[in-house]
Amino acid sequence: FSPLRRISIKILVHSLFSMLIMCTILTNCIFMTMNNPPDWTKNVEYTFTGIYTFESLVKILARGFCVGEFTFLRDPWNWLDFVVIVFAYLTEFVNLGNVSALRTFRVLRALKTISVIPGLKTIVGALIQSVKKLSDVMILTVFCLSVFALIGLQLFMGNLKHKCFRNSLENNETLESIMNTLESEEDFRKYFYYLEGSKDALLCGFSTDSGQCPEGYTCVKIGRNPDYGYTSFDTFSWAFLALFRLMTQDYWENLYQQTLRAAGKTYMIFFVVVIFLGSFYLINLILAVVAMAYEEQNQ
């Protein structure tokens, strides 16, 4: 080994070196949280970049760059260090127009803490392993969601556009003429029935067990879907999103109530099956796989 490499190895294995890097990263993170940093922080920024460059140079000199099994670029954690340094110099010396977008990559410096703290490294390793193991479960989940999304599409397509429309129109008004002139929320409230405090028109349906309109209103299919048009089963993608909402139980009871009011209470069966299969079974299957991966990593 050359004297330079011997020195690099000595520095690299020294505990103070690890402490210095960790302190640098933490200080850098503190500086990154500043809202309006003063001018002198620019020099501090250069210092941080210098320390990171020094760290990488030491690692390269001690282990070699990329040829050989234990060299710098053969360790995935060093890829992060390399990217951090490359972006630090890119944003400083190369004029790339939208610098603010590139400055976002400075946040990657915070991730360097993972490679420095051994405990974190283990946890992240386990997380990556669990993601690999999750692929099969994810395929199953997406498949199940797709199947139920297609069923939902067939059962409820267009149903959430059913609204209670005012019957007593002016003598020359028609549904179409009104829809063409409606602009504001206030205009909508004149012609559609809204429950107090509701931001969407009251849903209704055409089957005997679906929601009925109050006196003076009739059920029509017109306008957009509830929740600014985001809640519907009108296309496969919207149906898939609705099913994902059910699986994650994200305000699912609202979707359940809306759909049952528009389609009929019989369709409760669909929701029971989805909640049992998607929410109770698949979610717990995912958790089980993650738990197994952590257990394996610990062993």
Epitope: G158, F165, N167, T174, E176, F206, T218, C219, V220, K221
Partner: nanobody, 124 residues
């Protein structure tokens, strides 16, 4: 496809009576309001009477007390009973309805539908 067909028109003497009917056909799920309009020769179309699905009614001032609108929800039909007819009631009578129906492909559509009209002539 939804169709509205009017019938019952004809020639009648002043002071006489006529009963117009308008039947809606097709894969109808719900009929909201149903209205009668009329258009005299060389004049604009004017509203005559309306009835909602919960049987609330409304009339034009010119026919109040003389005309009565009713509907049979089971038959998807609206009727216009016209009494004490006057020569100025001579016109082509149109039926209009707000219909929600199941259209091709099984999807639901709501819209305003019109009939072809039935001619009522009041003359001595």
């Amino acid at each position: 496809e939804v169709q509205l067909v009017e019938s019952g028109g004809g020639v009648v003497q002043p002071g006489g009576s006529l009963r117009l009917s308008c039947a809606a056909s097709g894969r109808i799920l719900r009929i909201g309001y149903m209205r009668w309009h009329r258009q005299a020769p060389g004049k604009q179309r004017e509203f005559v009477a309306r009835i909602t699905d919960d049987s609330a009614t409304g009339y034009a001032d010119s026919v109040k007390g003389r005309f009565t609108i009713s509907r049979d929800n089971a038959k998807n039909t609206v009727y216009l009973q016209m009494n004490s007819l006057r020569p100025e009631d001579t016109a082509l009578y149109y039926c209009e309805a707000l219909v929600t129906a199941s259209v091709r492909g099984g999807s639901i559509h709501s819209g305003t539908y019109w009939g072809q009209g039935t001619l009522v002539t009041v003359s001595s």
